[in-house]
């Protein structure tokens, strides 16, 4: 539906259940350990409602003694998932989220998967691999991204309101043309932010205004034709 002067405009991106992974391919397993140690921690933005696969350092499984995944989520006790090669046993401590699992049997694949990432999966994930040559770590600061819902409407003559609702992180709103604007942010307990920009255009030759919302999950633009100034009947341009 095209944008217009009175109808509420909404936009919500639909995510097919995509998968994202930072795993190295098998060729990189042969790289030396110093390369692994240099890449201890990674910040990783992941879209909500996608699948994520987190990987351990690329060390051949035959060299392993123990693999441990340590998961620290906000407001929860630290969860550990461990696999001991010698006894072929797995152990979990304080792990309650059934969506966070080994990709397959840990003796075959040390990767961790999160099925249908949620806001609650924001946190720190660390794989610790104990080998005869020492311990090797790889950590992920997982940042869950939430696409904001975008709306644009007019509430007064030549004043428009653009909202980016419940985004994570906060979206940025800009306008074409620039107006006399005020922007407010509202923070929600789940970590999302609503950004509201209210603008007024005094210049009478401005016909249509465009709200542009920039966000890590993608950008969105909506436009709306401004209502006439009250009492204005005729003007030559």
């Amino acid at each position: 539906q095209p944008n217009n002067s009175l109808m509420l405009q909404t936009s919500k991106e639909n995510h097919a259940l995509a998968s994202s992974s930072l795993c190295m391919d098998e060729k990189q397993i042969t790289q030396n350990y110093s390369k692994v140690l240099a890449e201890v921690n990674t910040s990783w933005p992941v879209k909500m409602a996608t699948n994520a696969v987190l990987c351990c350092p690329p060390i051949a499984l035959r060299n392993l003694i123990i693999i441990t995944w340590e998961i620290i989520l906000r407001g929860q006790p630290s969860c550990t998932k461990a696999y001991k090669k010698e006894t072929n046993e797995t152990k979990e401590t304080n792990c309650t989220d059934e969506r966070i699992t080994w990709v397959s049997r840990p003796d075959q694949n040390s990767d961790l998967q999160i099925r249908t990432v949620a806001i609650t999966h924001d946190g720190y994930y660390r794989c610790i691999m104990v080998t005869p040559d020492g311990n090797f770590h790889r950590g992920y600061h997982l940042q869950v991204l939430v696409t904001p819902e975008v709306t644009l409407f007019q509430n007064r003559n030549r004043t428009a309101v653009c909202k980016a609702v419940a985004g994570k992180p906060a979206a940025h709103i800009s306008w074409i043309p620039e107006g006399d604007c005020a922007t407010k942010q509202e923070y929600w307990s789940n970590g999302t932010v609503t950004v509201k920009s209210t603008c007024h255009w005094e210049v009478h030759n401005v016909s249509t205004v465009t709200c542009h919302v920039s966000h890590l999950t993608g950008n969105k633009s909506l436009y709306i034709e401004l209502l006439p100034v009250p009492g204005a009947k005729k003007s030559a341009k």
Partner: antibody, heavy 114, light 107 residues
Framework: QVQLVQSGAEVKKPGASVKVSCKAS????????MHWVRQAPGQGLEWIGN????????NYDEKFQGRVTMTVDTSTSTAYMELSSLRSEDTAVYYC???????WGRGTLVTVSS | DIQMTQSPSSLSVSVGDRVTITCQAS??????LHWFQQKPGKAPKLLIS???NLEDGVPSRFSGSGSGTEFTFTISSLQPEDAATYYC?????????FGQGTKLEIK
């Protein structure tokens, strides 16, 4: 689905006036600006002006100021564009458009000839 | 008034080729625009709204990009039925203004 149905072709003599109509359906007529655009044979597109049916507010391009009159009949959801003092260079297809230019009528051919 | 400079004014391209048309707004003034296709005897047909939004039912070989004052319309792989004249329209300021058009013919 917005539909704009325009009146039929007209042949006029120089100095006469023509009134083209555009009947809208499929949306709230009084909530959307109605624009008028014309296209002379083999030429580009030219904006004439617009009218807001909810209030009757109008903007005309200065090129047409004094010769063009835009009106609406909200009871029939119809917009009108009248052009007076016609000359041969006003021979063109006249289009109405709404929804921020995303919905167009099929056009009305106005021929000005002596 | 905002002038829209559209280029090229005409081009002749082979089927399967990539076509790029540009529109630039005068005065360095940021605007928003639509892209239209017009075939002889027909009303302009909206292809791209708001600079980059592909309209329903329009083939995905058509795309629009750009922001501010510089905009690009692209046909990724030209088809015989794409022979037409293409126009940009800025709708941010009154008067609305069109580019002068690009006549696209098939070699």
């Amino acid at each position: 689905q917005v539909q704009l149905v325009q009146s039929g072709a007209e042949v006029k003599k120089p100095g006469a006036s023509v009134k083209v109509s555009c009947k809208a359906s499929g949306h709230t007529f009084t909530s959307y600006w109605m624009h008028w655009v014309r296209q002379a044979p083999g030429q580009g597109l030219e904006w004439i002006g617009n009218i807001y049916p909810g209030s009757g507010s109008i903007n005309y391009d200065e090129k047409f100021q004094g010769r063009v009159t835009m009106t609406v009949d909200t009871s029939t959801s119809t917009a009108y564009m009248e052009l007076s003092s016609l000359r041969s260079e006003d021979t063109a297809v006249y289009y109405c458009l709404t929804m921020t230019g995303t919905s167009w009528g099929r056009g009305t051919l106005v021929t000005v000839s002596s | 008034d905002i002038q829209m400079t559209q280029s090229p004014s005409s081009l002749s391209v082979s089927v399967g080729d990539r076509v790029t048309i540009t529109c630039q707004a005068s005065q360095g003034t940021p605007i928003n625009l639509h892209w239209f296709q017009q075939k002889p005897g027909k009303a302009p047909k909206l292809l791209i709204s708001g600079a980059s939004n592909l309209e329903d039912g329009v083939p995905s070989r058509f795309s629009g990009s750009g922001s501010g004052t510089e905009f690009t319309f692209t046909i990724s792989s030209l088809q015989p039925e794409d022979a037409a004249t293409y126009y940009c329209l800025q709708f941010t300021y009154i008067p609305w203004t069109f580019g002068q058009g690009t006549k696209l013919e098939i070699k």
